[in-house]
Interface confidence: medium
């Protein structure tokens, strides 16, 4: 039983897996996806130069890295025909100025001074075709992908913003690059790292 799938025109849909993008191009700074620094990977291009007010002799100690991350976009049972590649922001934007903060018997540390983070600076929109099983027609989506990273001072806007997840599924990394695990929202479908097949 063969079913032929016809290509449909690009449309913008509101759904849990993707975010509507009004038009292609660059966008002002939206709420960032803050990465948990459990794993540190080397930057492929070294990232952009750090933007921070701290004075230091060795800038190499901290930098805002742009790591390439390849993943599939998913929406329910549907998945993008091809993986998309975007940047994941990682790195330290200033020297570790930490003060002891005793909580109970454990030793906790909290940062001192302005809180600068390596967060997305620019975004790009990409049109993606999602293939759906069971004879369902393909879906078209516009997804917002991180295009560059920058060290920025966190504001209330950043701190109070809900962390967004665009329902993406990690794909096998490009040669010589290792992906970092991303923070997933509860809304996102149960995306798992892809097996290398």
């Amino acid at each position: 039983h063969h079913h032929h799938h016809h290509h449909q025109g690009w449309q913008a849909f509101k759904n849990d897996a993707t975010e509507i993008i009004p038009e292609l191009g660059e966008y002002p700074e939206p709420p960032p996806e803050l990465e948990n620094n459990k794993t540190m990977n080397r930057a492929e291009n070294g990232g952009r130069p750090p933007h921070h007010p701290f004075e230091t002799k060795d800038v190499s100690e901290y930098s805002c890295r742009e790591l390439h991350f390849t993943r599939y976009v998913t929406d329910g049972p549907c998945r993008s025909a091809k993986p998309v590649t975007e940047l994941v922001c990682s790195g330290q934007c200033g020297p570790a100025r930490l003060l002891p903060n005793a909580i109970g018997r454990g030793k906790w540390w909290r940062p001192s001074g302005p809180d600068f983070r390596c967060i997305p600076d620019r975004y790009r929109a990409q049109r993606v075709q999602l293939l759906c099983p069971g004879g369902e027609a393909p879906r078209a989506r516009k997804v917002r992908l991180v295009a560059s990273c920058k060290c920025k001072r966190l504001t209330r806007f950043h701190n109070q913003s809900e962390l967004k997840d665009f329902g993406t599924e990690a794909a096998r990394p490009q040669k010589g690059r290792k992906p970092r695990p991303r923070a997933r929202s509860a809304k996102a479908n149960q995306a798992e790292l892809e097996n290398a097949y």
Epitope: H1, H2, H3, H5, Y72, T74, P77, R79, A81, K82, Q129, L131, P133, G134, G135, E169, A171, N189, Q190, A191, E192, L193, E194, N195, Y197
Partner: nanobody, 120 residues
């Protein structure tokens, strides 16, 4: 030619469990999605659960928390573990396989279906 062979259906009491299996044979491309759909008498075929070769899964709201889909890529087999079955789960369950080549669908295959009846 690809063939899908389903098994595991049957009669079960409400609250019981069943495990469906679907084995695919033939020339199957590695980038694929396998899933289960069901059709009750007088109703349209509906999605139950799907799983991509990459591991991405999706479930119909009506079965979330009760059904679990899994697969064995080496055997080209997909499983559907159905727990806490309800009378409304009664239907013919169909296995589906779709494969992707160079970013487009290469094929879309269906099994013959296996009957699941939940009744006391």
């Amino acid at each position: 030619e690809v063939q899908l062979v389903e098994s595991g259906g049957g009669l079960v009491q409400p609250g019981g469990s069943l495990r469906l299996s679907c084995a695919a044979s033939g020339s199957i491309f590695s980038d694929n999605v396998m899933g289960w759909y069901r059709q009750a008498p007088g109703k349209q075929r509906e999605l139950v659960a799907t799983i991509w070769s990459s591991g991405h899964t999706n479930y119909a709201d009506s079965v979330k928390g009760r059904f679990t889909i899994s697969r064995d890529n080496a055997k080209n087999t997909v499983y559907l573990q159905m727990n806490s079955l309800k009378p409304e789960d009664t239907a013919v369950y169909y296995c589906n396989l779709g494969t992707i080549v160079t970013g487009t669908w290469r094929s879309d295959y269906w099994g013959q279906g296996t009957q699941v009846t939940v009744s006391s």
